[in-house]
Interface confidence: medium
């Protein structure tokens, strides 16, 4: 932003130093420099002389007018040509910034990562203002009519420990700028009721030779949650379409879901988790890899994520790192 | 005569801030824009941002939530804050003074020597 | 962001040699007020860089007149008619049009 200066003068805009992109505003500048009446006042924005659209109103005052203004930030300052002085003089400078009213924030959504000991908050904010916006979280208890307030610039992380008042709340965002503000509406939650279990993580795989050969996938997650619903999807690196399979687990041990899967295809599969019954997923795990032998394989072997893989009794792919999913839209 | 002079920490460690300050001499801010460019070791320069006579200031968009610049007018000094440091941060970073040509082009006539910066644990 | 790009990378030339920098700009360096702000710069092993030419063709005080630009819209050319010894390092063009600033990447002038 703008930083002090000594002034020898005044600048200021109509209507208002920020305002609504691609409104018409004016700048004007207005000299109080002693011993000097201005031969001329010049406009600066970001640094060059601006050459049109300027208005000398009177002996001390100019005025710089923009049509349609779209740029969102611009730092303007205006000088001064005195008679006798061989530089222009400065006579002040702001910053104007241009934008939009916040939108009305949508889509609030509010899930406890298992063993995260917060509650983390979320939201769509809508189309970008481009200039500096708040968001207010409040946060009020059902039972005891308490309500918290969290000014944010984005999401928020609420400490589970600082919900006491009960299990029940709404939660509603304001969205707040110069140019207006908005409200979301009301989202009732109960804190057993979005609680998203610890991730679930494919750990290895491996093809063994049957009468067809099958897949096996192991996968686990050190949740406590005892009733907990997943979907396993998988498909040929080459294809669009996800094949998904359920399952009702229990976490006591290391899953093992079998596959019939195609030879000499690489394969990629993806596991996610909610607790049963409830509303929200965990996003799905990191992408894991796996290709399947050339024909019914012979002797023991084993593979990384990557590509290398020998044909053999076992064909074992094993975790090696993670590559991000790109689907953290599904908590919903 | 014209000159620049900027100092800095050194060494930062990552996710640590840096300070830098470049003092002036020899010329007045009320004329002259100032600006902030860094250079990592072996490669181009970068432009971080420029303070004008008027007092604003813009930033490069890319660093800019990392970013302030700021002046003591008093002390003629100018100076340049980044926070969140990581290793690719490192760079001599320089300050430089832009001399207006009458239509308002600004080019960077003098520059300082430049402070190195070394992003390390 | 405006993207300038220079070449070649490095250029080898003999004292007395006439030598050739190109610098090309993603869009268009005329401002809405018809200037183009477009500038040359050198840098010195160990040295910080110095001001060459400004505003496409402008020399700036004190630079031999050896160094010529010229060029419009978004091509852009640095000259320097007979290459002397002093003029080797690193070359960037730099426009000032639009904000943020931006540099092309460098050019290396080095003695044959």
């Known amino acids: 932003g703008i930083t002090n200066i000594n002034c020898s003068g005044h600048i200021w805009v109509e209507p208002a130093t920020i305002f609504k992109m691609g409104m018409n505003i004016s700048i004007y500048c207005q000299a109080a420099i002693k011993n000097c009446q201005p031969r001329k006042l010049h406009f600066y924005k970001n640094g060059i002389k601006e050459r049109f659209q300027i208005t000398r109103i009177n002996k001390t005052t100019a005025r710089l007018w923009y049509k349609n203004f779209l740029e969102p930030h611009a730092s303007m300052y205006c000088t001064a040509e005195c008679p006798k002085h061989f530089q222009e003089t400065l006579i002040c400078g702001k910053d104007i910034s241009s934008g939009y009213p916040p939108d009305i924030p949508d889509e609030v959504t509010c899930v406890i990562y298992e063993y995260s000991g917060n509650m983390t908050c979320t939201w769509n904010a809508g189309k970008l203002t481009y200039i500096d916006t708040k968001y207010v979280v409040h946060v009020k208890s059902l039972e005891t009519e308490e309500e918290q307030q969290y000014l944010t610039s984005s999401y928020i992380n609420i400490s589970t420990d600082s919900l006491q008042g009960g299990k029940k709340y709404l939660v509603w965002v304001q969205a707040a700028n110069a140019l207006g503000m908005e409200e979301s509406k009301q989202l009732q939650i109960h804190l057993d009721d979005i609680v998203i279990p610890s991730a679930a993580v494919i750990s290895r795989a491996e093809t063994i030779n049957a009468t067809v050969p099958k897949t096996i996938i192991y996968w686990d997650s050190q949740t406590t949650i005892e009733k907990v619903s997943c979907e396993m999807r998988y498909k040929a690196t080459t294809n669009q379409t996800w094949n998904v399979k359920e399952f009702d687990t229990n976490f006591t041990y290391v899953q093992q879901s079998e596959f019939y899967l195609e030879p000499n295809i690489k394969y990629v599969f993806q596991v996610r988790c909610q607790e049963t019954g409830k509303r929200y997923w965990q996003p799905w795990s990191s992408l894991f890899f796996h290709k399947t032998p050339e024909t019914v394989p012979q002797v023991t072997s084993k593979a990384f994520q990557h590509d290398t893989w020998n044909s053999g009794l076992t064909v074992a792919s094993i975790s090696t790192g993670h590559l991000t999913s790109d689907n953290r839209g599904d908590i919903g | 005569d014209v000159q620049l002079q900027e100092s800095g920490p050194g060494l930062v460690a990552p996710s640590q801030s840096l300070s830098i300050t470049c003092t002036v001499s020899?010329?007045?801010?009320?004329?002259?824009?100032i600006t902030w460019v860094r250079q990592p070791p072996g490669r181009g320069l970068e432009w971080l941002g420029v303070?004008?006579?008027?007092?604003?200031?813009s930033y490069n968009l890319a660093l800019k939530s990392r970013l302030t610049i700021s002046r003591d007018s008093s002390k003629s000094q100018v100076f340049l804050e980044m926070n969140s440091l990581q290793t690719d941060d490192t760079a001599r970073y320089y300050c430089?003074?832009?001399?207006?040509?009458?239509?308002?082009?600004?080019?960077?006539?003098?520059w300082g020597q430049g402070t190195s910066v070394t992003v390390s644990s | 962001d405006i993207v300038l790009t220079q070449s070649p990378l490095s250029l080898f030339v003999s004292l007395g040699d006439q030598a050739s920098i190109s610098c090309r700009s993603s869009?268009?360096?005329?401002?809405?007020?018809?200037?183009?702000?477009l500038h040359w710069y050198l840098q010195k092993p160990g040295q910080s860089p110095k001001l060459l030419i400004y505003?496409?063709?402008n020399r700036f005080s004190g630079v031999p007149d050896r160094f010529s630009g010229s060029g419009s819209g978004t091509d852009f050319t640095l000259k320097i008619s007979r290459v002397e010894a002093e003029d080797l390092g690193v070359y960037f063009c730099?426009?000032?049009?639009?904000?943020?600033?931006?540099f092309g990447g460098g050019t290396r002038l080095e003695i044959k």
């Open positions: 505003k496409v063709s």
């Open positions: 869009q268009s360096l005329v401002h809405s007020n018809g200037n183009t702000y």
């Open positions: 303070l004008w006579p008027g007092g604003g200031i």
């Open positions: 430089a003074r832009n001399w207006r040509h009458y239509d308002g082009s600004y080019a960077m006539d003098f």
């Open positions: 020899g010329f007045s801010f009320n004329t002259y824009a």
């Open positions: 730099s426009q000032s049009t639009h904000v943020p600033w931006t």
